[in-house]
């Protein structure tokens, strides 16, 4: 828990350089995000494909979309879970991180020093050991997050099932209802290829309790979709006399010394002129 209050931002006096004053873990061990580069990667043949159970959410069900002042968050049902880790990890929410229209490079994880346009996090908690995400969040093996790197490209109808509701959650504290859809559609091709490491929440309180799975392949959203994400939301309440745009809501990469990131794939990805790999 924070030493005093829960005010934190991505910019200004309460920005990430100050997080550790109120949230000591933010200055501690196993911090995320990180840069994924070749000299820290090690292939691990035991990293088998994950199975995504209960990800196909019925449109007859309503799911709460919230502007929490830091991101836009979609609540997920507890019977949605990942199979293939040491315990069952049940879903709790998903949210995004992004940059701004002038610098649309707001992913949290980077690959060989390069940012992607944005990043999706699907947060799960260890439901074999803990009753809810809140309890699990500061416990060992408590959380597992799937991270999807997002690049600018073609229009993505699946992501639009979230983006089309942004106008109803423009300000902090606002909530809207989203029809269920297949969350697996938000994942990239070849989900069997991923990076795996032990890290932390990328937001305060930065608990070092996250098993990270970062998918190797990005998904695409259109320039218009990215712009909508970058311009639709505010960090402040509707009646705030000093509105603040919700932009650049990503943490800088953290030092990652004397540790390894494990990959489910062997690193070489050669493309010939014919497009074969």
């Amino acid at each position: 828990a924070p030493v005093n209050g829960s005010k934190w931002t991505y910019f200004g006096p309460d920005g990430e350089n100050s997080w550790s004053k109120k949230y000591p873990s933010c200055g501690g061990l196993l911090q995320s995000p990180i840069d994924l580069h070749s000299d820290i990667l090690q292939y691990d043949a035991s990293l088998t494909p994950l199975e995504f159970q209960g990800y196909n959410l019925s449109a007859n069900k309503q799911f709460l979309l919230t502007n929490n002042g830091h991101s836009v968050k979609l609540n997920l049902p507890s019977d949605m879970h990942i199979q293939g880790l040491q315990s069952r990890y049940s879903a709790t929410q998903l949210h995004l991180h992004w940059g701004n229209p002038n610098d649309p490079h707001g992913s949290e994880h980077t690959v060989s020093g390069q940012h992607f346009a944005a990043e999706l996090h699907i947060v799960h908690y260890n439901s074999d050991l803990y009753p809810d995400a809140s309890t699990a969040s500061n416990k060992s093996e408590g959380l597992a997050v799937l991270a999807v790197l997002i690049e600018m490209g073609s229009f993505n109808p699946s992501y639009d099932k979230i983006f089309s509701h942004l106008q109803h959650v423009k300000y902090k504290g606002q909530e809207a209802f989203v029809p269920g859809f297949n969350i697996e559609e938000l994942l990239p091709e070849r989900t069997a290829e991923y990076y795996r490491y032990r890290g932390s929440l990328t937001t305060p309180p930065c608990n070092p309790t996250v098993l990270w799975t970062v998918f190797r392949n990005p998904v695409q959203i259109s320039q218009e979709q990215l712009l909508a994400l970058e311009t639709a939301l505010y960090c402040t309440h509707m009646d705030d006399p000093s509105p603040r745009e919700m932009i650049n809501n990503f943490r800088q990469v953290q030092k990652f010394d004397e540790r390894l990131v494990y990959t489910s794939f062997s690193q070489v990805q050669v493309c010939t002129a014919a497009g074969l790999s």
Partner: antibody, heavy 121, light 106 residues
Framework: EVQLVESGGGLVQPGGSLRLSCAAS????????IYWVRQAPGKGLEWVGY????????TYNQKFKGRATISVDKSKNTAYLQMNSLRAEDTAVYYC??????????????WGQGTLVTVSS | DIQMTQSPSSLSASVGDRVTITCRAS?????MHWYQQKPGKAPKPWIY???HLVSGVPSRFSGSGSGTDFTLTISSLQPEDFATYYC?????????FGQGTKVEIK
């Protein structure tokens, strides 16, 4: 025939609590959320909260958070509304209802008959 | 919260009259739904997604509108139409209803 039937209403003392039931039949119970909506005498409709019978996940109108608890017994196809610290303003007909998706959002296609709760000493 | 204001709150009309009920939302909503309620009964779904009549609802009813202003219109009022009508939005949490418009016999 799809049906929702509420029960458990009656006279309750101020400060007391109520537990209402909503029994469903005629459809696959876990496929739809169950909502509780109330209507004070001569007044409009007010949403209390809902439950997903498949997993017990609940969402509440902020106004009732901490005072209302919705639960479910899947084996009985029945949802429950428990409300505590009742006051005179909680006097209302309480309905359960089921929303159906039509291609963009939902509307309440099935309603129970309602059960009257009167809070009075 | 999105406040829903219906007007008028009640109206008296005769059989055969054209009746218009308005619902104004305090913020923009995507769609509006309408329910009919008769005394001592549960509400019935009447119009969904602003303009679509629920199966069995007579074609003299219609709905229209967008953004913050929506209307329910009865082209030729019939005896069975005397009831209270409620609008409802589902765009934002909490979902909210209008206070109702009571259509009475003149």
């Amino acid at each position: 025939e799809v049906q929702l039937v509420e029960s458990g209403g009656g006279l309750v003392q101020p400060g007391g609590s109520l537990r209402l039931s909503c029994a469903a039949s005629g459809y696959s119970y876990t496929d739809y959320n169950i909502y509780w909506v109330r209507q004070a005498p001569g007044k409009g409709l007010e949403w209390v909260g809902y439950i997903d019978p498949a997993n017990g996940d609940t969402t509440y109108n902020q106004k009732f958070k901490g005072r209302a608890t919705i639960s479910v017994d899947k084996s009985k196809n029945t949802a429950y509304l428990q409300m505590n610290s009742l006051r005179a303003e909680d006097t209302a007909v309480y309905y359960c209802s089921r929303p159906i998706y039509y291609g963009a959002y939902w509307y309440f296609d099935v309603w129970g008959q309602g059960t009257l709760v009167t809070v009075s000493s | 919260d999105i406040q829903m204001t219906q007007s008028p709150s009640s109206l008296s009309a005769s059989v055969g009259d054209r009746v218009t009920i308005t619902c104004r939302a305090s913020s923009s909503v995507t769609y509006m739904h309408w329910y009919q309620q008769k005394p001592g009964k549960a509400p019935k779904p009447w119009i969904y997604a602003t303009s679509h009549l629920v199966s069995g609802v007579p074609s003299r009813f219609s709905g229209s509108g967008s953004g913050t202003d929506f209307t329910l219109t009865i082209s030729s009022l019939q005896p069975e139409d005397f009831a209270t009508y409620y609008c409802q939005q589902w765009s934002s949490n909490p979902l909210t209803f209008g206070q109702g418009t009571k259509v009475e016999i003149k």
